[in-house]
Interface confidence: low
């Protein structure tokens, strides 16, 4: 058993039929010595008396809010949560496996630049009685600070008959060094509590590997005289690291016909303009990627040829 | 050339070669995300590689103040990786494919390090750790780890030279 936060404890249980469970001793936080009784949750049934209560925790029915009283007055609370281990593996019932970029990916994170700021998100089908707490650090043995905000519900989607809820959190490395080569990964730890079930999820990454720039901005077309060619121009996204002479992007320009089956013409360039042939009913799209490190491409920015 | 005495390097040449290094490093090991190499308990093997750290003056301001600190750090790293790519980690079994970019990568590392340090000048170089894994599978894993680490190193070096070429060239 260990303390998650004040008056909240996690009991780690091997979860199999007829498992013996864990013996837990609760102590009432009071100078009183006698006349103390214990109850569980909203029930008024007395579970025991005395300053300590010994319980055998085997299942969720044994978890919950234990309260000690004296003469009708509440003295203290202890909330017991369960963390299940099945076949040596901690349960992952609360979050959905996003399966990208690989199986058992519960947390996904992205950064728009090298400032040390990143956003992580996760999915669940659970809509109520759910809380998350997020901690992060750079490295684990001698951790350097990363500050995370509160996890917040960011989207709700309908998937067939099921609803899916997306939560996200924004974190910022306290002393980020955008120009340095990272040697220690960022560690993100999410504590998830659903009713009386506790689970924890972790992710480890370098900022450079989760970079995904915003799409290029101010995408414009300028027809070239007496030609089907146009000059496409764009700018670096506002959120990209500066100076751009140091934090450079490379771009992919695509001409796409109305039909998905039509051949796509693609041009790669380090410049912020390109000359392409604009076909009727086609659209021109541009996306960006770090010039020197192959992390994710941005989403496309698009304009119609017309 | 970036001579230790403090004269300016051939920023544009360094920029072109470092950008080529980036391309080669990624073509040598393009499997981003397919193998999480940090899960393989590899602390002792890749902890010794020289990293371009915060105090090494490789940020835009540090380069403006005095680029020599940063160039020395990059030179150290280039020599280190050049030695690793020439060691039995890469030359031993399993043999690299004939068209593997590792040979070209090795030559380009040497080329850039020579651009930074002409004959007769000596910067202190970091001792290469004795990494000689006995099993071919260990060697393969170590190659991947070294290449992933090299990708990060050359990306920072390429930024430095791109910025230098744009803002510090005479």
């Amino acid at each position: 058993i260990w303390e998650l936060k004040k008056d909240v404890y996690v009991v780690e249980l091997d979860w199999y039929p007829d498992a013996p469970g864990e013996m837990v001793v609760l102590t009432c936080d009071t100078p009183e010595e006698d006349g103390i009784t214990w109850t569980l949750d909203q029930s008024s049934e007395v579970l025991g008396s005395g300053k300590t209560l010994t319980i055998q925790v085997k299942e969720f029915g044994d978890a919950g809010q234990y309260t000690c009283h004296k003469g009708g007055e509440v003295l203290s609370h202890s909330l017991l949560l369960l963390h299940k281990k099945e076949d040596g593996i901690w349960s992952t019932d609360i979050l959905k496996d996003q399966k990208e970029p690989k199986n058992k990916t519960f947390l996904r994170c992205e950064a728009k630049n090298y400032s040390g700021r990143f956003t992580c998100w996760w999915l669940t089908t659970i809509s109520t009685d759910l809380t998350f707490s997020v901690k992060s650090s750079r490295g684990s043995s001698d951790p350097q600070g990363v500050t995370c905000g509160a996890a917040t519900l960011s989207a709700e989607r309908v998937r067939g008959d099921n609803k899916e809820y997306e939560y996200s959190v924004e974190c910022q490395e306290d002393s980020a060094c955008p120009a340095a080569e990272e040697s220690l990964p960022i560690e993100v730890m999410v504590d998830a509590v659903h009713k009386l079930k506790y689970e924890n999820y972790t992710s480890s990454f370098f900022i450079r590997d989760i970079i995904k720039p915003d799409p290029p901005k101010n995408l414009q077309l300028k027809p070239l005289k007496n030609s089907r060619q146009v000059e496409v121009s764009w700018e670096y996204p506002d959120t990209w690291s500066t100076p751009h002479s140091y934090f450079s992007l490379t771009f992919c320009v695509q001409v796409q016909g109305k039909s998905k089956r039509e051949k796509k013409d693609r041009v790669f360039t380090d410049k912020t303009s390109a000359t392409v042939i604009c076909r009727k009913n086609a659209s021109i799209s541009v996306r960006a990627q770090d010039r020197y490190y192959s992390s994710s491409w941005s989403e496309w920015a698009s304009v119609p040829c017309s | 050339r970036a001579v230790p005495g403090g004269s300016s390097p051939a920023w544009t040449q360094c920029q072109q070669l470092s950008q080529k290094l980036c391309t080669l490093a990624w073509s040598a090991h393009p499997l981003v995300g397919h193998m999480d190499l940090r899960e393989e308990g590899d602390e002792e093997t890749t902890n010794d590689v020289p990293h371009i750290q915060c105090g090494d003056g490789c940020d835009p301001q540090g380069l403006r103040d005095n680029s020599q600190f940063c160039l020395q750090r990059i030179h150290q790293g280039l020599i280190f990786y050049e030695k690793l790519l020439g060691s039995d980690i890469f030359t031993g079994e399993p043999s690299l494919l004939p068209d593997s970019p590792v040979g070209q990568l090795h030559a380009s590392l040497l080329g850039l390090s020579q651009l930074l340090q002409p004959e007769g000048h000596h910067w202190e170089t970091q001792q290469i750790p004795s990494l000689s894994p006995s099993q071919p599978w260990q060697r393969l894993l170590l190659r991947f780890k070294i290449l992933r680490s090299l990708q990060a190193f050359v990306a920072v070096a390429a930024r430095v030279f791109a910025h230098g070429a744009a803002t510090l060239s005479p």
């Epitope: 500050t147 905000g149 917040t152 989207a155 996200s168 924004e170 | -």
Partner: antibody, heavy 120, light 110 residues
């Protein structure tokens, strides 16, 4: 107790500028997304702009894009809205509001508002 | 003007139950949570309900919100004179990537 106190409103001529401030107290300001929402006299609520906890990501309604700038100073627990090129249709009570968590929605606490009047 | 549609007014007598509707589209109410705000005369809006039907502490359970498809509603039972106010629905809009509000409903307690 969460408190948000706006200031900086007043009468300004079309084309003029104003800077609104919102002083926050009673919570860890740097952990929360913040928004500005306005309400024209006798009308409904219109979301104006939002900023993430660290100040990194900002977003604006189309009606104010390019003219208004949201910012924050986490060391001073203060949110700002710099309003330039003001128009008569910007006349409204401007509320600063806290996002529930690091996101910008839902808005769980609102200030009392500050009135901006754009008129010649 | 407003992405979400509300009736401009509603009324009821003390003790009665009244319902205020809010209609949107698949990009807002259809795919996101609905939030309701109460604005008493001359005051700032106050959060009444979020994530479709959760109430912040201090909001009486006479207020209950629900959602179905691209519509939502707020029901107030046991109407009291202090409930006289403007009520606004709001939701995140995936297309606009920002919150959108209804035009508000003025509730009068007769």
């Amino acid at each position: 107790e969460v408190q948000l106190l706006e200031s900086g409103g007043g009468l300004v001529q079309p084309g003029g500028s104003l800077r609104l401030s919102c002083a926050a107290s009673g919570f860890t300001f740097s952990n929360y997304g913040m928004s500005w929402v306005r309400q024209a006299p006798g009308k409904g609520l219109e979301w104006v702009s939002r900023i993430w906890p660290s100040g990194g990501y900002t977003k604006y309604a189309d009606s104010v894009k390019g003219r208004f700038t949201i910012s924050r100073d986490n060391s001073k627990n203060t949110l700002y809205l710099q309003m330039n090129s003001l128009r008569a249709e910007d006349t409204a009570v401007y509320y600063c509001a806290r996002g529930k968590g690091s996101g910008s929605f839902p808005l769980d606490y609102w200030g009392q508002g500050t009135l901006v009047t754009v008129s010649s | 003007q407003y992405e979400l549609t509300q009736p401009p007014s509603a009324s009821g007598t003390p003790g009665q139950r009244v319902t205020i509707s809010c209609s949107g589209s698949s990009s807002n109410i259809g795919s996101n949570f609905v939030t309701w705000y109460q604005q008493l005369p001359g005051t700032a809006p106050k959060l009444l309900s979020y994530t479709n039907n959760q109430r912040p502490s201090g909001v009486p359970d006479r207020f209950s919100a629900s959602k179905s498809g691209t519509s939502a509603s707020l029901a107030i039972s046991g109407l009291q004179s202090e409930d006289e106010a403007d009520y606004y629905c709001a939701a995140w809009d995936d297309n606009l990537n920002c919150p959108v509000f209804g035009g508000g409903t003025k509730l009068t307690v007769l």
